[in-house]
Amino acid sequence: MRRGPRSLRGRDAPAPTPCVPAECFDLLVRHCVACGLLRTPRPKPAGASSPAPRTALQPQESVGAGAGEAALPLPGLL
C-alpha cells in the first residue's frame, strides 16, 4: 500500500495521514519523514536570504527555503 491505512474517523480517531506508519508529515520540508526526524524552526543567521518563518495565518511565497512552520507530527495509522 502506498499510504497508511484509513478508517472513518470517530470522535477521538487520529486524522488521516499522507504518510506510511512510523512516518510523519513535516511542515518545514513538506513531505513525510521518519517521525524521529521532525524538524523545528531555527533562528536564521543575519542576512539570510530565505523568508522569515511563517505562521499558519501568514503564508508567504518562497523560492526554496524551508517553510518555517513547526513540524506537525501525524504518524501513519497503525
Epitope: 504518510c19 513538506r30 526554496g64 501525524l74
Partner: antibody
C-alpha cells in the same frame, strides 16, 4: 480515482501572459498535506519544476523563474492556476500539473502544449 | 539547488534483459527521491517513491535502491511496455530538481 487535466491557450505571442488551469478530481486541496505542482518539458528535452501550492496556501517557485510566475488555487472548484508573464519562445513546452501528497507528486495530468511564436 | 546527475542518458536493451539507471545527488537528499516513467505519448507515472518503495500497481520487476548519494532504478526483466523515458526527482528541498532523463530503447 485521482485525475488531473491541464488546459491552456495553445499558442501565444512573445510578451503575452500564459494562463494555465489544472482541473482535478478525486481529492480536495482543503485536505491537510495536499498540494498541486507544475512542471514543464520543452519538446525533446527534460523536465523542469516550476511551482507548487499547498492546502494552506503556502507557495514555492523555481528561483530562476520566480519573477514571472504566479500560482493560485480555487479550492471549491478544484482548480489550480499558473500564470507565466512575458513569455518567450523558450517557454514553448508541454506543461503538466501533478498532485502532491506525502511523497511529492503521485499523480500527473496528461499535459497541455504551449507554442510561443510571433 | 540540488543537482541530480542521471546516467546513462540513453540505453539500448533487449526484452528480458536486466537494466539499471542511476541518479547521483550533489547534496544529501536522505532518500527523498522518486522515479518517474514517461511514455512516448507524454504520460508520466510515478514508479517509486522514497528511493525504494514501489507505487501500487507497479510491476515488481521495478525496484529502487540507494548507495550513499547514488540512487538506482533497476528493471529485472524488460518488457515491451518498459521502453520509455525515466527520470529521477529529488524532493528533499525546494526547488525540486529532476535528473536529465534516460531514454530506454529496444535493441
Amino acid at each position: 480515482q485521482v485525475t488531473l487535466k491541464e488546459s491552456g491557450p495553445g499558442i501565444l505571442q512573445p510578451s503575452q501572459t500564459l494562463s494555465l488551469t489544472c482541473s482535478f478530481s478525486g481529492f480536495s486541496l482543503s485536505t491537510f498535506a495536499m498540494g498541486v505542482g507544475w512542471i514543464r518539458q520543452p519538446s525533446g528535452k527534460g523536465l523542469e519544476w516550476l511551482a507548487h501550492i499547498w492546502w494552506d496556501d503556502v507557495k514555492y517557485y523555481n528561483p530562476a523563474l520566480k519573477s514571472r510566475l504566479t500560482i493560485s488555487k480555487d479550492t471549491s472548484n478544484h482548480q489550480v492556476f499558473l500564470n507565466i508573464a512575458n513569455v518567450d519562445t523558450a517557454d514553448t513546452a508541454t506543461y503538466y500539473c501533478g498532485r502532491t501528497y506525502g511523497y511529492d507528486v503521485d499523480y500527473w495530468g496528461q499535459g497541455t502544449t504551449l507554442t510561443v511564436s510571433s | 539547488d540540488i543537482q541530480m546527475t542521471q546516467s546513462p542518458s540513453s540505453l539500448s536493451a533487449s526484452l528480458g534483459e536486466r537494466v539499471s539507471l542511476t541518479c547521483r545527488a550533489s547534496q544529501e537528499i536522505s532518500g527523498y527521491l522518486n522515479w518517474l516513467q514517461q511514455k512516448p505519448d507524454g504520460t508520466i507515472k510515478r514508479l517509486i517513491y522514497a528511493a525504494s518503495t514501489l507505487d501500487s500497481g507497479v510491476p515488481k520487476r521495478f525496484s529502487g535502491s540507494r548507495s550513499g548519494s547514488d540512487y538506482s532504478l533497476t528493471i529485472s526483466s524488460l518488457q515491451s511496455e518498459d521502453f520509455a523515458d525515466y527520470y529521477c526527482l529529488q524532493y528533499a528541498s525546494y526547488p525540486r530538481t529532476f535528473g536529465g532523463g534516460t531514454k530506454l530503447e529496444i535493441k
